[in-house]
Each structure stands twice: as structure tokens, then as C-alpha cells.
């Protein structure tokens, strides 16, 4: 058999460290900010700034805190009950279908279209056809007019909570 991790090696959530408050589970569940101990008898605090849990749970591990990537700003830090809130930097946005990275906002609308929405941390500029008023799909054609926009002011955070 393998014999590798000693009690000293174990991650803090597996030790009864002084800074980790323990309490008893309520009906088998531990409160937000805690996970259940391996023996099922205690609730152990998540490690501030390292992991978290948002709901009553019987998890053996807390969830890892998100670390904001370069190109993101941290709106609020990770606590034991809430994940880090990261937001794309000015001039970039995060799409729902590719939430793992911030993309640059377009600088202008294609020919024959007008801008009706600014760049925000969660959306590209919005363009509509001058005549019909229908939205542009978001694909950028090869030729663009020099209709430029300044990045919009962030209105709300884009949370990557797990």
C-alpha cells in the first residue's frame, strides 16, 4: 500500500487547526462557510481566501476560490461564504458562451449599422441596421466604419461563483 500523506502534510481543512472553528452538523448539514468533517461529526470552517461554500451542505471539501485572471479586476474578494467576484477590465467583455475569458469589445459598428449599446463588462457594443433596426449578430465583417465607442461604465459585476 502507499503511505504518503502524514497528518502534518494534510491540507488545513483536514486538520483541527486553531483558526478553524468546529460545530456540529444540523440534520447532517453544515452551514455556509463550512464543510463536513470526514467522520461526519463536525462542521469545519472553510479557509478564508482559499475556499468557500455558499449553502448548507454535506460537502467533504469546500470549493476553491476563483483567482481573477489578468484582464480582470477583482470586485470583491473570496470569503468563506462567497466566491471572488471578477469583472472584465474596461473595454473587454465576457460572453455567456465563453465565460472563461474576457474578449475585446469592437471599436465600431459595421457599415450600414449604428451603435445603440455601449461596451460593458458583460456585453459587446450593440449594433442595429440603420433602416430595419434589427440587431447585428456580433460577427465582425472585414470592413468597419470608423464609428467608435468608448467603453461603457460598469453597472454590475460579472460573478464567476461556482
Amino acid at each position: 500500500e502507499s503511505a504518503l500523506i502524514t497528518q502534518q502534510d494534510l491540507a488545513p481543512q483536514q486538520r483541527a487547526a486553531p483558526q478553524q472553528k468546529r460545530s456540529s452538523p444540523s440534520e447532517g448539514l453544515c452551514p455556509p462557510g463550512h464543510h463536513i468533517s470526514e467522520d461526519g461529526r463536525d462542521c469545519i470552517s472553510c479557509k478564508y481566501g482559499q475556499d468557500y461554500s455558499t449553502h448548507w451542505n454535506d460537502l467533504l471539501f469546500c470549493l476553491r476560490c476563483t483567482r481573477c485572471d489578468s484582464g480582470e479586476v477583482e470586485l470583491s474578494p473570496c470569503t468563506t461564504t462567497r466566491n471572488t467576484v471578477c469583472q472584465c477590465e474596461e473595454g473587454t467583455f465576457r460572453e455567456e458562451d465563453s465565460p472563461e475569458m474576457c474578449r475585446k469589445c469592437r471599436t465600431g459598428c459595421p457599415r450600414g449599422m449604428v451603435k445603440v449599446g455601449d461596451c460593458t463588462p458583460w456585453s459587446d457594443i450593440e449594433c442595429v441596421h440603420k433602416e430595419s433596426g434589427t440587431k447585428h449578430s456580433g460577427e465582425v465583417p472585414a470592413v468597419e466604419e470608423t464609428v467608435t465607442s468608448s467603453p461603457g461604465t460598469p453597472a454590475s459585476p460579472c460573478s464567476l461563483s461556482g
Partner: antibody, heavy 115, light 109 residues
């Protein structure tokens, strides 16, 4: 020194039953979750089931839910896996593993399901 | 969720090799990753836990990392030695189920 010794493997017909045991020593058995992990011949590792240190919580992979039952006897420092309605695809080496981190593994016991 | 690893990698002694482990649906971004080494005919042993921590007895040549943007974990082995030839498995945890990658066979040429 942590030691985990599995037993109870063998040849069984499809639809049959088998009970695996794991004798543990070298650590405070009741303080740790325990798992069974299996490995089919020439294949990768597959987690099967886990149980909390007190035995109050049990967890199962979808592939064995309703057929396998994990249990433990803390007074005997022994982990069990009761396997019913066995199928050919359950053929594997079954490892007894200590802790939520799966940090110590036994040598395994072979279970063969064949007619 | 699933964890996907390359089937095999190979490198010469003394060199550095990296084995990737890509998760589905943000799983690796949220949950800690462990790595196990399994030499032929032996039980697995843990070489990295909680993303990048090394148990005692595991050489400093082994290191782990996480890349949230690609939802992947990596195991890097530097100064490759012939005894590093083995199967390597990543593993993570998703609400009280333990999930393994398919394994990567490392060949030291």
C-alpha cells in the same frame, strides 16, 4: 504505518453476489472517510463508493447505485463492500482507499464476473 | 462531470514533461485536483493533492497547477527519471462523488 488489506475477491457468475472486506491499521479508522475504487483490466481508475468515518453518510457512483452497499465496523477497523446483481462490467481489481484525499491505497483484490 | 487526459506522452530522461487534465462544465475551476502515479503492477500513490501540494516523500520534481481560463489542471515532472515511467491519473471531487481522468501513460524514452 498505514496498512489496508482487501479480501473477498474471486470468480462469481453474472447476477451473483460477493462481499469484499478491508482490514485497516496504523491510523484512527473512525476519523476518516473510506472509499472503494476499482480498475478493470487494462483500464483506468473508477471511484465506486465512499462512507464517512462514522458510517452515517454513504456515497455511490451511478454505475453501482442500488446494487452495491458500503459499510464499516469501526470496532473491528474494517470496511466492507456488499456487491449484488453483479455484471461482467464489474470485473476489476477493487482497491480500499483511506481518506477523502484518497491518500493511502491497499494492494487490491480481483473480482471476476463471468459465466 | 468528466476529466479528459491525453492517452500517452513521452519524453527523454532529464527533460520536463507536462500532463494535462481538462474538466467539463467548470469543474476544475471550482474543485481541487489530485494526481496519482501508478507503476505497472502496483496500486496508485498520490503525488499531488489540493492542486499543487506535495505529500512527504514525493520529489520536488513533481508540481501541479490550475488554469481556470482553460478549465484544466496540469502535472509537470522535471528532470525526468526512468522510474517516473507510469500511468498518471488526475482526480477531482464534485458534490460527494470522486471523478478520475482516463489516465496518461508516461514513457521515458
Amino acid at each position: 504505518e498505514v496498512q489496508l488489506l482487501e479480501s473477498g475477491g474471486g470468480l462469481v457468475q453474472p447476477g451473483g453476489s460477493l462481499r469484499l472486506s478491508c482490514a485497516a491499521s496504523g491510523f484512527t479508522f473512525s476519523s476518516y472517510a473510506m472509499s472503494w475504487v476499482r480498475q478493470a483490466p487494462g483500464k483506468g481508475l473508477e471511484w465506486v463508493s465512499a462512507i464517512s468515518g462514522s458510517g452515517g453518510s454513504t456515497y455511490y457512483a451511478d454505475s453501482v447505485k442500488g446494487r452495491f452497499t458500503i459499510s464499516r465496523d469501526n470496532s473491528k477497523n474494517t470496511l466492507y463492500l456488499q456487491m449484488n446483481s453483479l455484471r461482467a462490467e464489474d470485473t476489476a481489481v477493487y482497491y480500499c482507499v483511506k481518506g477523502a484525499w484518497l491518500d493511502y491505497w491497499g494492494r487490491g483484490t480481483m473480482v471476476t464476473v463471468s459465466s | 462531470f468528466m476529466l479528459t487526459q491525453p492517452h500517452s506522452v513521452s519524453e527523454s530522461p532529464g527533460k520536463t514533461v507536462t500532463i494535462s487534465c481538462t474538466g467539463s462544465s467548470g469543474s476544475v475551476a471550482r474543485n481541487y485536483v489530485q494526481w496519482y502515479q501508478q507503476r505497472p503492477g502496483s496500486a496508485p500513490t498520490i503525488v499531488i493533492y489540493e492542486d499543487n501540494r506535495r505529500p512527504s516523500g514525493v520529489p520536488g520534481r513533481f508540481s501541479g497547477s490550475i488554469d481556470r481560463s482553460s478549465n484544466s489542471a496540469s502535472l509537470t515532472i522535471s528532470g525526468l527519471q526512468t522510474e517516473d515511467e507510469a500511468d498518471y491519473y488526475c482526480q477531482s471531487y464534485n458534490y460527494n462523488t470522486w471523478v478520475f481522468g482516463g489516465g496518461t501513460k508516461l514513457t521515458v524514452l
